[in-house]
């Protein structure tokens, strides 16, 4: 039952507002950026070097034939397999005010299936047996979503969004910087 | 060339006083986070606070809240520790560590600088 | 006693594959991204790894990272006499909301 064929295509996913706990800040004031003296980027920056690509939750397309013993559906199917790496900061416009991306270790999100789909399926089977019909449960889409203390990796195709809980000692709301300071934090995270 | 420089260090008696800074050069400042981590002698590393582009994003470690403020100057392209009522467990060598805002990992770090708690 | 669990220590020959564990709780590991620290004697802490399994460029391909529910663990395949250093794993701690570190484990090459 491996994957047979070939990739269609791959779709970026951005995750819902609804997977971070915290609210953005207004973006109010012209934070000015201050370059240290030699200026530049430090080298060996963990994602200097990375394809963007590599660190999103993509929907590859894959067609494969389903089986089920001896028997074969007469026509592939579609499917989609979720893919990559989720950073919050990175995908989510406004992110930045969201939960304390400051921090050297953050929200951790997985590219995890979102909805399924069932899909009627004719096996064809050898022998002169009759053909069989069959429902298939296939991946329809895919999200990136956080992990939270009430589920682990085995669970994760079946958790839902984080439940809310109060934070310790929650900071003052963040004098943000511009905008175009701001857009330039969302390009990697996590 | 990248370079956090520590300073500030030094031998100190239980319950003054003592302010340590670091110098940063060679990345841009403001897309920094830094950090305090210190390690005491032949022990592990210990994450003391972490201060995000300015005042409204700081942490600190239970063992030192209360004790110790940290704070940054960007136009000085400067961080500090401002330690007050020293102990003897706070002996150790006091490391100054950033990471890009919003990426994970402290990539950046300087060589420390040791307090010395002692009578 | 450290917020993260590390063996003490660890050892292998050259060549060899060697494992070092980090167990954790729902509110670091199991929830946060984890990074892990190399410290050569006498020198700063270096970033290994961050977020769960990623290598910061100039990092070899022969140190690699994972997580699984609350605990990750480091590999490091094809042991070389310069990977002898103390390897730390960290998180950040929700509950704590500090950065916590494992006790560190050290790693001979025999």
């Known amino acids: 039952q491996g994957w047979q064929a070939f990739k269609n295509d791959a779709t970026e996913i951005i995750p819902e507002l609804g997977e971070y706990p915290e609210p953005p800040p207004e973006l109010e004031n012209n934070k000015t950026m201050n370059r240290a003296e030699n200026g530049g980027r430090p080298p060996h920056h963990p994602f200097e070097t990375k394809d963007v690509s590599e660190y999103s939750c993509r929907e590859l397309h894959f067609t494969r034939y389903v089986t089920d013993g001896p028997c074969r559906s007469a026509k592939p199917v579609t499917e989609l397999v979720c893919s990559g790496q989720c950073g919050p900061a990175r995908l989510l416009p406004n992110a930045i005010g969201r939960g304390k991306w400051w921090r050297p270790s953050g929200p951790d999100f997985r590219c995890i299936p979102d909805r399924y789909r069932a899909q009627r399926v004719q096996l064809l089977c050898p022998g002169g047996e009759a053909p069989r019909a069959r429902k298939v449960r296939l991946v329809a889409s895919c999200k990136c979503k956080r992990l939270t203390r009430f589920h682990n990796q085995s669970e994760l195709k079946d958790f839902g969004t984080e439940a809310a809980r109060p934070q310790k000692g929650r900071k003052p709301r963040p004098r943000a910087r511009s905008a175009k300071a701001n857009q330039a934090e969302l390009e990697n995270a996590y | 060339e990248v370079q956090l420089v520590e300073s500030g260090g030094g031998l100190v008696q239980p319950g003054r006083s003592l302010r340590l800074s670091c110098a940063a050069s060679g990345f841009t400042f403001e897309d920094y986070a830094l950090h305090w981590v210190r390690q005491a002698p032949g022990k592990g590393l210990e994450w003391v606070s972490g201060i995000g582009w300015d005042r409204d994003f700081i942490d600190y470690a239970d063992s030192v809240k209360g004790r110790f403020t940290i704070s940054r100057d960007n136009a000085k392209n400067s961080l500090y520790l401002q330690m007050n009522s020293l102990r003897v467990e706070d002996t150790a060598l006091y490391y100054c560590a950033g990471n890009k805002i919003g990426y994970g990992g402290l990539d950046v770090w300087g060589q420390g600088t040791t307090v010395t708690v002692s009578s | 006693q450290s917020v993260l669990t590390q063996p003490p220590s660890a050892s292998g020959t050259p060549g060899q594959r060697v494992t070092i564990s980090c167990s954790g709780s729902?509110?670091?590991?199991?929830?946060?991204?984890v990074n892990w620290y190399q410290q050569l004697p006498g020198t700063a802490p270096k970033l290994l790894i961050y977020s769960n399994n990623q290598r910061p460029s100039g990092v070899p391909d022969r140190f690699s990272g994972s997580k699984s529910g609350t605990s990750a663990s480091l590999a490091i395949s094809g042991l070389q006499s310069e990977d002898e250093a103390d390897y730390y794993c960290a998180a950040w701690d929700d509950q704590l909301e500090a950065y916590v570190f494992g006790g560190g484990t050290k790693l001979t090459v025999l």
């Open positions: 729902s509110s670091n590991i199991g929830t946060n991204t």
